[in-house]
């Protein structure tokens, strides 16, 4: 019996890829289960072999092209089902009718860099990776900074509500290292969620000019 | 407000047939799979089958496999299960469900769930 203790969650990147995880208390550990994408409108399908992330939970990446190929559309509906071998068949474990652009989350945003930085001041930059042309500017960020002594818990996120690939970082302290991260979301879908965060990239403030106050 | 009502549910004999109905209310409905558990007395509630809006289904359980069939009619929010040749051991209380994936829900999901219809079937 299946008692709700099983989660089957996928998100689509926009371009070519659908990430999915599928967990399950007590499945067998050593059994075979793979994703399967079946469009309704297109003539490909695809499978991915889910492999294991934890002690009851599955992930795979189910790539349906180039990365930066529109594979899909916000008319395609994709079925995903999990099936697991038992025996000599593969059996459905579970099924859900999948609309892309409404289940979005983006790749984490690449290409951080300091444009110029001061005393109390950096100006950063990055870029987005693998989004769709249909979102034009319709995008928004969200960004932290890492002071020493916090973790990045604690930090407060700053909301770019607009598609904007830099930040400048006000009242920072002097000659002192700090992290920042970035992550961004389409304001398109019901299901939508925030990207990873980038790679964090590490800078240091400049000194105070000698003899001056800080 | 979401509402799934059940019907169809009843005594049969042993090798009759039953229609359970499943009306479905209160929201979009084209992102969710409908489908059907079902609890034994003194049982925990099990999967039985479910069907998305495209019209794919997931297998049946060996149980019942060849018996039971499903359908769904989008038009009026509507999942059927058609049940033949019934047994004994197939005396329940059939629930109705609906969530974005079937029989498991994604993460942050809500399953709705109908109030069950009690399905006996005498020998």
């Known amino acids: 019996a299946v008692n709700g203790t099983s989660q089957f969650t996928c998100f689509y990147n926009s371009r070519a890829n659908i990430s999915c995880v599928w967990s399950q208390d007590g499945a067998l550990q050593d059994t075979s289960c793979q994703v399967h994408a079946w469009p309704d409108r297109r003539r490909w399908n695809q499978t991915c072999e889910l492999l294991p992330v934890s002690q009851a939970s599955w992930a795979c990446n189910l790539i349906l092209g180039a990365p930066d190929s529109q594979k899909l559309t916000t008319v395609d509906i994709v079925t995903l089902r999990v099936l697991c071998r038992e025996g000599v068949r593969w059996r459905v474990m579970a099924i859900q009718d999948f609309k892309p652009f409404e289940n979005l989350r983006l790749m984490a945003p690449i290409s951080l860099q300091v444009v110029h930085v001061e005393t109390h001041r950096c100006n950063i930059s990055w870029e987005i990776s693998q989004a769709s042309h249909y979102f034009e500017r319709h995008l928004e960020f969200e960004a932290r900074t890492l002071s020493p002594g916090h973790t990045w818990e604690e930090a407060p996120l700053l909301t770019l509500k607009q598609k904007q690939e830099w930040i400048c970082l006000e009242t920072l302290t002097p000659d002192t290292q700090y992290e920042f991260q970035v992550r961004v979301k389409p304001l398109q879908g019901e299901f939508t969620t925030w990207s990873p965060w980038s790679q964090p990239l590490a800078f240091r403030t400049k000194p105070a000019a000698l003899g001056k106050d800080t | 407000e979401v509402q799934l009502v059940e019907s169809g549910g009843g005594l049969v004999q042993a090798g009759g047939s039953l229609r359970l109905s499943c009306a479905a209310s209160g929201r979009d409905f084209s992102s969710y799979a409908m489908g059907w558990f079902r609890q034994a007395p003194g049982k925990e509630r099990e999967f039985v089958v479910a069907i998305t809006w495209t019209k794919r289904s997931t297998d049946f359980p060996d149980s019942v496999k060849g018996r039971f069939t499903i359908s769904r009619d989008n038009a009026k929010n509507t999942v059927y299960l058609d049940m033949n040749s019934l047994k004994p051991e197939d005396t329940a209380v059939y629930y109705c469900?609906?969530?974005?994936?079937?029989?498991?829900?994604?993460?942050?999901?809500?399953?709705?769930w109908g109030e069950g219809t009690l399905v006996t079937v005498s020998s």
């Open positions: 469900a609906s969530a974005r994936g079937l029989p498991v829900t994604p993460l942050g999901d809500i399953i709705y």
